[in-house]
Amino acid sequence: EVEKTACPSGKKAREIDESLIFYKKWELEACVDAALLATQMDRVNAIPFTYEQLDVLKHKLDELYPQGYPESVIQHLGYLFLKMSPEDIRKWNVTSLETLKALLEVNKGHEMSPQVATLIDRFVKGRGQLDKDTLDTLTAFYPGYLCSLSPEELSSVPPSSIWAVRPQDLDTCDPRQLDVLYPKARLAFQNMNGSEYFVKIQSFLGGAPTEDLKALSQQNVSMDLATFMKLRTDAVLPLTVAEVQKLLGPHVEGLKAEERHRPVRDWILRQRQDDLDTLGLGLQGGIPNGYLVLDLSMQEALS
């Protein structure tokens, strides 16, 4: 807290300019008018103030706007944004995508800070949904953003926004998140032809049900092993050997290297060894010939 002292004669700031870096903290407090600061915030970022000095300027803005800063000030905070606490940011009402971009730029190229997380939360809540332009912006700055949302939050993503999603944006998504995103992607890409559709939907397939995987197996898609390994185990288990062979195409040979890992391991345990042998890959662990297969899950459902 800076002591209230009178501004020395001739030092009253008439504009926010570089001469202010030569002001001591108490001079900034005494000689810079908060309203002037608010109208000329865009200049502050171009002046190499110390954060100690910026603290004084922040204090002046806090006094002027105790209920939270107006967007005209927020948009021009620049490096002063890095002095804001999440509590400060929760008071803001940020509606302009330009404001969001300006503040994300300050944090660019680095992990999401608590301030940025709060800012994004305020912005998205204010908009009511995660529209395409917002998603475009957020994933450009933070590729992992989508996967940081809960399934409930993801449910507000309209299918049209899915076009903004790049494969790397989904790298850290878990199955619960993909369960929500996959139906939206399916809807978004439904009018595309076979090969184009597969290219777009591929990253979302970790949320695909069995019937969709069966349908894909009829389309010569040649799914790579990395994608196959990310499929839901419960969606893979009902697939036949023939369906998996068609789904993977030339990549089917990769099953051997993955036979100890899910979902391949669990799928092998559900197939007849005879059928597995037709692949010629030496996959072991299938059901021996002559054994009866009981679907216990079906039996439990009936009892």
């Epitope: 103030f49 954060y51 190229g109």
Partner: nanobody, 119 residues
Framework: VQLVESGGGLVQPGGSLRLSCAAS????????VAWYRQAPGEQREPVAA???????IYADSVKGRFTISRDNAKNTVYLQMNSLKPEETAVYYC???????????????WGQGTSVTVS
């Protein structure tokens, strides 16, 4: 984060010195950089500063004689001081306006200072 100054020493009036400040450690980012000085019994005051965009600002008393520069590849800031005067005897401090990700806030970083004596 550490800022380490070097290049200080004893110089005759009218002489020149070049101060260097090397930044090391993991810093989130550096925005502005500056040189400050503190004469015996005085408060620390800015001498020269540079914004992230490369604009430079000088105290009136050093304009035309001092030059601040920055080599981003070497993480180093320089202060070229020419036509030095006895009253410029002081400890010169390097300053960086940065961001500490661990703290989650913008931070002021200061070097330990390098002594310049003009006599």
């Amino acid at each position: 984060v550490q800022l380490v100054e070097s290049g200080g020493g004893l110089v005759q009036p009218g002489g020149s010195l070049r101060l260097s400040c090397a930044a090391s450690g993991s810093m989130f980012s550096i925005n502005a950089v500056a040189w400050y000085r503190q004469a015996p019994g005085e408060q620390r005051e800015p001498v020269a500063a540079m914004t992230s965009g490369g604009s430079t600002i000088y105290a009136d008393s050093v304009k035309g004689r001092f030059t601040i520069s920055r080599d981003n590849a070497k993480n180093t800031v320089y202060l070229q001081m020419n036509s030095l005067k006895p009253e410029e005897t002081a400890v010169y401090y390097c300053y960086a306006q940065g961001y500490d990700y661990d703290e989650g806030y913008g931070m002021d970083y200061w070097g330990q200072g390098t002594s310049v004596t003009v006599s």
